[in-house]
C-alpha cells in the first residue's frame, strides 16, 4: 500500500479507563496532529479506520464492531466501549485515508480494575482548593458526551470509601461538589459515580480526583528571606570552609515559579572563577507553602573571598527580594607569649 504518515505511538496520551464502564475515545489525529477536524475530513472523502494490537502481541488486527449489544462501536471520530473489558487493553490506531492520502497515530489504552473503595492504578488529576477561602467547588470530570442532556443521571459523591452525606462543610450538588470552607482535613480522593440509563441498560462512570488544600492567595506574601540576616556574621579565617545558607519562605501561589539564587560581587556563581558549590533543598508545608534553602559553599576561602559581597536573591509571582550575608575575616587572636613579652617591655 502507499506510504502513510505515521505519527507513531502517542505515549503522551496514555488513556486509562475503568473495567466494565463505558469509554469514549476520540481519535487523537484531529485533536493534536492534523489541522482539520473530522467533519472536514469526512466531507473531503476521507475514511477513518480503527485497528488495535492486543497487550503483549505484535499483530495488528481490525477491531470487531460486530460484538453482541454493539459493545464496541465507532461514531464519527469516537471509538465507543459499552462497556470495557479487561482484555481491551492494548495499543489502538486510528488511520485517516483515501486513495491519495493517509495519516495514522497509535495510542495506548489501559483498562484498569478498581476495588470497592475506588482504589486503582489510575493516575488521578489533582484539584487544588484554597484553604479557608469561601465557597469553592470541584466538578465531576470527563463525563461530557456520554449521555444526551435529556437524560438526568444520578450522581453519588464519595470521599475515599465513604458516601458524602451530611459531611458538614462539603455539599454534593449533582455534578458539582461544593466546599463551604476547605480545610486540611478535606485533603483526599473524591469520587463521583455517575449512573445513567441507555437502551434499557444501566451504565456507571467512575471518576476520582485528588483534592489538595493549599495556601490562599489572600494570605500570599512576597518571598521572605530568613537567612542570611543581620544577626548572623560569617567570620572565617583564610583556608577555612565558608558555608552560607540562603533560606527563603514562599507562600503558595498557583502556577508561580519560585526562584532562589546567589550573586557574588553582583555576578552569578557560574560567571566567576571562585571554586564555589551550591546545594539546594526544598520542603513544603501542608498547604504547599515552600521553603527553599541554597547553601553556598567555598571549601578553602581566601582573604579575597572574604571581602566579596554575597547576596541571596528570591523571586516569586508576588515580588523579588534580596539580602546580603555579613561575611568578614576573623582577626587572629594575639599569641599569649608575644603578648606577655610586649607587656614586660621585652625586645
Amino acid at each position: 500500500s502507499e506510504r502513510c504518515d505515521d505519527w507513531g505511538l502517542d505515549t503522551m496520551r496514555q488513556i486509562q479507563v475503568f473495567e466494565d464502564e463505558p469509554a469514549r475515545i476520540k481519535c487523537p489525529l484531529f485533536e493534536h496532529f492534523l489541522k482539520f477536524n473530522y467533519s472536514t475530513a469526512h466531507s473531503a472523502g476521507l475514511t477513518l479506520i480503527w485497528y488495535w494490537t492486543r497487550q503483549d502481541r505484535d499483530l495488528e488486527e481490525p477491531i470487531n464492531f460486530r460484538l453482541p449489544e454493539n459493545r464496541i462501536s465507532k461514531e464519527k471520530d469516537v471509538l465507543w466501549f459499552r462497556p470495557t473489558l479487561l482484555n481491551d487493553t492494548g495499543n489502538y490506531t486510528c488511520m485517516l485515508r483515501n486513495t491519495t492520502y493517509c495519516s495514522k497515530v497509535a495510542f495506548p489504552l489501559e483498562v484498569v480494575q478498581k476495588d470497592s473503595c475506588f482504589n486503582s492504578p489510575m493516575k488521578l488529576p489533582v484539584h487544588k482548593l484554597y484553604i479557608e477561602y469561601g465557597i469553592q467547588r470541584i466538578t465531576c470530570p470527563n463525563v461530557d458526551g456520554y449521555f444526551p442532556s435529556s437524560v438526568k443521571p444520578t450522581i453519588t459523591w464519595y470521599m475515599g470509601c465513604y458516601k458524602i452525606q451530611n459531611f458538614n462543610n462539603v455539599i454534593p450538588e449533582g455534578m458539582n461538589l461544593s466546599f463551604l470552607i476547605a480545610l486540611i482535613s478535606n485533603n483526599g480522593n473524591y469520587t463521583c459515580v455517575v449512573t445513567y440509563p441507555e437502551n434499557g441498560r444501566t451504565f456507571h462512570l467512575t471518576r476520582t480526583l485528588t483534592v489538595k488544600v493549599v495556601g490562599s492567595p489572600k494570605n500570599a506574601v512576597p518571598p521572605v528571606i530568613h537567612s542570611p540576616n543581620d544577626h548572623v556574621v560569617y567570620e572565617k579565617e583564610p583556608g577555612e570552609e565558608l558555608l552560607i545558607p540562603c533560606t527563603v519562605y514562599f507562600s503558595f501561589l498557583m502556577d508561580s515559579r519560585n526562584e532562589v539564587w546567589w550573586t557574588i560581587d553582583g555576578k552569578k556563581p557560574d560567571d566567576i572563577t571562585i571554586d564555589v558549590t551550591i546545594n539546594e533543598s526544598i520542603s513544603h508545608s501542608r498547604t504547599e507553602d515552600e521553603t527553599r534553602t541554597q547553601i553556598l559553599s567555598i571549601k578553602k576561602v581566601t582573604s579575597e573571598d572574604l571581602k566579596r559581597s554575597y547576596v541571596c536573591h528570591a523571586r516569586s509571582a508576588k515580588g523579588e527580594v534580596a539580602k546580603a550575608a555579613k561575611v568578614k575575616q576573623k582577626v587572629p587572636a594575639p599569641r599569649y607569649t608575644v603578648e606577655l613579652a610586649c607587656g614586660f617591655g621585652a625586645t
Epitope: Y133, I135, I171, E173, S178, L180
Partner: antibody, heavy 122, light 110 residues
C-alpha cells in the same frame, strides 16, 4: 449569651444612603462562619441580600438585585458586620436581619438578630 | 435564579393535628433546604437544615424530608407555641451562590 444585634436602621429619603451594623457577642467571627444580611418588607416574606465569608479571604456574595447598590463588609477585630446601602428606593423599606451561617454544619443559618427597620420615604 | 414555591400559603389547624407544609424548587437543589419558624416581631428560627437534619434545641415533633425539587416539613402533633409562619430556604452553592426563601406558610388556630 450568643447573639447578634443590628443597628443603624432609620428613615431615609429615596436616593439616600445608610450603613447598618450588626454586633456579635458570645462568639467570634471565624473561618467557619459566613455572615449574612436578609431583609423582610412589611407583611412580606424573607429575602436574601448578601453574605461575606468571615475567614481571611473575606469573599463576598450578593443577590443579583443588590449588586452595585449594597456593599457588605466586616471588621473581625470588632466582631461587627456592616451593610452599606446606597441609592435607596421605597422598595428597600424592610426590617434588615443579620444572620450567621455555620459552614461546618452544612451551611445552616443557625443564629439571627432581631432586625433593624429601614424606611425609605420622602 | 431558583424559585421556591411553598404551599399552602396559610392553613388552619388545631392543637394535636399533624401538619404538613410542602416546598417545591424550580430546579434540583439536592438536599440544600432549610425550614424556619417566625413569630410576629421576632427573627426567624432555624428548625431543619440539609432537608432533614433537626437543628439544635428543636423539638422532635418537627421533621423534614425530600430531595431534589420536592420537600416537606411535618409537625407531628401541633402545639400552641407552633402557631407561626414557616419559611423554606434553598441554597445553591455551585452556581452563585444563591439563597432563596419560599413565600411562607402561616399556620393559624382553627
Amino acid at each position: 449569651e450568643v447573639q447578634l444585634e443590628e443597628s443603624g436602621g432609620d428613615l431615609v429619603q429615596p436616593g439616600g444612603s445608610l450603613r447598618l451594623s450588626c454586633a456579635a457577642s458570645g462568639f467570634s467571627f471565624s473561618s467557619s462562619h459566613y455572615m449574612c444580611w436578609v431583609r423582610q418588607a412589611p407583611g412580606k416574606g424573607l429575602e436574601w441580600v448578601s453574605c461575606i465569608y468571615a475567614g481571611s479571604s473575606g469573599n463576598t456574595y450578593y443577590a443579583n438585585w443588590a449588586k452595585g447598590r449594597f456593599t457588605i463588609s466586616r471588621d473581625n477585630s470588632k466582631n461587627t458586620l456592616y451593610l452599606q446601602m446606597n441609592s435607596l428606593r421605597a422598595e428597600d423599606t424592610a426590617v434588615y436581619f443579620c444572620a450567621r451561617v455555620d459552614a461546618s454544619s452544612s451551611g445552616s443559618w443557625d443564629l439571627w438578630g432581631q432586625g433593624t427597620l429601614v424606611t425609605v420615604s420622602s | 435564579d431558583i424559585q421556591m414555591t411553598q404551599s399552602p400559603s396559610s392553613l388552619s389547624a388545631s392543637v394535636g393535628d399533624r401538619v404538613t407544609i410542602t416546598c417545591q424548587a424550580s430546579e434540583s437543589i439536592y438536599s440544600n433546604l432549610a425550614w424556619y419558624q417566625q413569630k410576629p416581631g421576632q427573627a426567624p428560627k432555624l428548625l431543619i437544615y440539609a432537608a432533614s437534619l433537626l437543628a439544635s434545641g428543636v423539638p422532635s415533633r418537627f421533621s423534614g424530608s425530600g430531595s431534589g425539587t420536592d420537600f416537606t416539613l411535618t409537625i407531628s402533633s401541633l402545639q400552641p407555641e407552633d402557631f407561626a409562619t414557616y419559611y423554606c430556604q434553598s441554597a445553591s452553592y455551585s452556581t452563585g451562590p444563591d439563597w432563596t426563601f419560599g413565600q411562607g406558610t402561616k399556620v393559624v388556630i382553627k
